[in-house]
């Protein structure tokens, strides 16, 4: 699984749904800002 790079990627809200004619990525931060280490990458396992 790849690490998540906060600095190089832009982000799109997964659940908001999309305008069928206009897909775009927002430039806001990812949905969770880690409290303990806000600049460290995070990853997610699909099957725990």
């Amino acid at each position: 699984m790849e690490d998540f790079n906060m600095e190089s990627d832009s982000f799109e809200d997964f659940w908001k749904g999309e305008d069928l004619s206009n897909y775009s990525y927002s430039s806001t931060l990812p949905p969770f800002l880690l409290d303990a280490a806000p600049c460290e990458p995070e990853s997610l396992e699909i099957n725990k």
Epitope: E2, F4, D9, S10, F11, E12, D13, F14, W15, K16, G17, E18, L20, Y23, Y25, T28, L29, P30, P31, F32, L33, L34, D35, A36, L44
Partner: antibody, heavy 120, light 116 residues
Framework: QVQLVQSGAEVKKPGSSVKVSCKAS????????ISWVRQAPGQGPEWMGW????????NYAQKFQGRVTMTRDTSISTAYMELSRLRPDDTAVYYC?????????????WGQGTLVTVSS | QAVLTQPSSLSASPGASVSLTCTLR?????????IYWYQQKPGSPPQFLLR?????????GSGVPSRFSGSRDASANAGILLISGLRSEDEADYYC?????????FGGGTQLTVLG
């Protein structure tokens, strides 16, 4: 790793309300929508709506309009879903979920689920 | 008629390739939608696998193996989840979903059984 941690199972009487919480453990809620999805026993998922944690803005599925209320308390990184006028067919596992996509892939987070049983 | 229709069950042997279909209701054109696919195992929430609209508009879920892929069959007005090199751990329920009329709509799911 960020996790969404939900409140425990509930048993409710028909006509009453239930309020389920969803806390971001290890992180803080940000601007991305938190959806609530329920799943009745043996059935597929059913989307109930979402809340924008920053603004508090909501988008409810038509089926639940007038019966569901989604709120959040950013000071404790927690979102809430309240469903009123409960019926037996509201018996389901209720999940919160959030996530985002970057050009390199999508990251989707789910709570562990909260079983709500509606029974007289 | 349901917005999204999936076959209720499917079985295949380890190592095989399987195609799970998600047929959109007549009047809803598959070419206009991203089709989202989820895997769910008993006692766990659904897990996002991938979304697919076209070869230039597709994304994998984080950590999802490349043997899970998407496509579409325009003639059948259906989205397709292809699982290659089937493994025993792929035994699960699979759901498709689309964003339609300002709401997320899920299919009824396909129960995939891995034989043997």
């Amino acid at each position: 790793q960020v996790q969404l941690v939900q409140s425990g199972a509930e048993v409710k009487k028909p006509g009453s309300s239930v309020k389920v919480s969803c806390k971001a453990s290890g992180g803080t809620l940000s601007s991305y929508a938190i959806s609530w999805v329920r799943q009745a026993p043996g059935q597929g998922p059913e989307w109930m709506g979402w809340i924008n944690p920053n603004s508090g803005g909501t988008n409810y599925a038509q089926k639940f309009q007038g019966r569901v209320t989604m709120t959040r308390d950013t000071s404790i990184s927690t979102a809430y879903m309240e469903l009123s006028r409960l019926r037996p067919d509201d018996t389901a596992v209720y999940y919160c979920a959030s996530g985002y996509c970057s050009p390199s892939g999508c990251y989707v987070y789910w709570g562990q689920g909260t079983l709500v049983t509606v029974s007289s | 008629q349901a917005v999204l229709t999936q076959p209720s069950s499917l079985s295949a042997s380890p190592g095989a390739s399987v195609s799970l279909t998600c047929t959109l209701r007549s009047g809803i054109n598959v070419g206009a939608y991203r089709i989202y696919w989820y895997q769910q195992k008993p006692g766990s929430p659904p897990q996002f696998l991938l979304r697919y609209k076209s070869d230039s508009d597709k994304q994998q879920g984080s950590g999802v193996p490349s043997r899970f892929s998407g496509s579409r069959d325009a003639s059948a007005n259906a989205g397709i989840l292809l699982i290659s090199g089937l493994r025993s751990e792929d035994e699960a329920d699979y759901y498709c979903a689309i964003w339609h009329s300002s709401a997320w709509v899920f299919g009824g799911g396909t129960q995939l059984t891995v034989l043997g």
